[in-house]
Amino acid sequence: MKVLQEPTCVSDYMSISTCEWKMNGPTNCSTELRLLYQLVFLLSEAHTCIPENNGGAGCVCHLLMDDVVSADNYTLDLWAGQQLLWKGSFKPSEHVKPRAPGNLTVHTNVSDTLLLTWSNPYPPDNYLYNHLTYAVNIWSENDPADFRIYNVTYLEPSLRIAASTLKSGISYRARVRAWAQCYNTTWSEWSPSTKWHNSYREPFEQHHHHHHH
């Protein structure tokens, strides 16, 4: 039994780091392998992660962590029974993948304006709470070419757009993801998408309506 692709890990900078690797053949990850991890810190102890299968030869392990600070460094040991397959280290602050934003809501009751809001995935005491920026993806279910990205570079988890920038009378979906420039993170996964029917009065119709009075 050998490791084909060495473990690579990312941290959510809160409570979980996820490590993935590939073996040289089909493996029952949960029964055959153990990933031991230990914070490099005085009087810390080794903890065991039981991996799950991620494809035939792939394994994934979710390492529980109390919290994360930039100084943290972990040793990682991948064991198959008594055989040490791989030894490495992982510094969570250098491999951050933020949690996905949640609770994406589209408010359509504001006159001719769409207000999209979502929740910051971190509690206020987490360092990333005040350092996330977002990308909002809006697309039409009817027209694959109608696909747009809005970059939200301010901290507030919301986006206002004119309803008229989208086509009227059709359904749209939106999703949002996050990243933090301070740690040069990767993008988070996309949030679950939310759907709404875009309808608004065309400017011409409004003008015509005005002249009838």
Epitope: L39, F41, L42, L43, S44, E45, A46, H47, L64, M65, D66, D67, V69, S70, A71, D72
Partner: antibody, heavy 125, light 112 residues
Framework: EVQLVESGGGLVQPGGSLRLSCAVS????????MSWVRQAPGKGLEWVSS????????YYADSVKGRFTISRDNSKNTVYLQMNSLRAEDTAVYYC??????????????????WGQGTTVTVSS | DIVMTQSPLSLPVTPGEPASISCRSS???????????LDWYLQKSGQSPQLLIY???NVAAGVPDRFSGSGSGTDFTLKISRVEAEDVGFYYC?????????FGQGTKLEIK
């Protein structure tokens, strides 16, 4: 009520051995690291050794490395200090102390918040 | 090893007056989580040491509120707002960020 009670001290000749014990009650022993600290007559405090709650992590002062062995029996709520090749400079009162919670991913530290009454080790010919 | 240096080594104080002991470490004893791994202990005559302050500023359970700790990085201070007769003894600072734990030489507080 937290209690730590050391025993096993005594008079021993240079080169001899002693085994100190520290019996603990009043807290979840296996969750906590334990430490030994000594104090030579008329001198200050000197850290000797520490062990994690599970026993997998062990640390020694350079002055005792290779001669002293720390261990613990979580089923007996006891931590031990096996002292071999004793020297005159090992003469001291030996204290055991409750250290940090070590079973968490990041050890939680609240100081050496409880100490035993100490046991005296005298190394002399 | 981290060297801990205390001053003064002897501190005569009048009851009711404040007292201050300084402790300096040869290396930073703060970890990335912002905690300073610096404690203060009092050893009264014929007794075991007792914890006063942990992680630089936290007052241990049962310790009178006249004791306080301050400082960060390499410079720390133990203050007693109003010294009482029962406060006499040796005061030690100790770093526990890395092994070996190291203590200061001790400060003897005595009543004038």
């Amino acid at each position: 009520e937290v209690q730590l009670v050391e025993s096993g001290g005594g008079l021993v000749q240079p080169g001899g051995s002693l085994r100190l014990s520290c019996a603990v009650s009043g807290f979840t022993f296996s969750s906590y690291a334990m430490s030994w600290v000594r104090q030579a007559p008329g001198k200050g405090l000197e850290w000797v050794s520490s062990i994690t709650g599970g026993g997998g992590g062990i640390y020694y002062a350079d002055s005792v490395k290779g001669r002293f062995t720390i261990s613990r029996d979580n089923s007996k709520n006891t931590v031990y200090l096996q002292m071999n090749s004793l020297r005159a400079e090992d003469t001291a009162v030996y204290y055991c102390a409750k250290d940090r919670i070590s079973i968490t991913i990041r050890p939680r530290y609240f100081g050496l918040d409880f100490w035993g009454q100490g046991t005296t080790v005298t190394v002399s010919s | 090893d981290i060297v801990m240096t205390q001053s003064p080594l002897s501190l005569p104080v009048t009851p009711g007056e404040p007292a201050s002991i300084s402790c300096r470490s040869s290396q930073n004893v703060v970890y990335g989580n912002g905690y300073n791994y610096l404690d203060w202990y009092l050893q009264k005559s014929g007794q075991s040491p007792q914890l006063l302050i942990y992680l630089g500023t936290n007052v241990a359970a049962g310790v009178p509120d006249r004791f306080s700790g301050s400082g960060s990085g390499t410079d720390f201070t133990l203050k007693i707002s109003r010294v009482e007769a029962e406060d006499v003894g040796f005061y030690y600072c100790m770093q526990s960020l890395q092994a070996p734990y190291t203590f200061g030489q001790g400060t003897k507080l005595e009543i004038k």
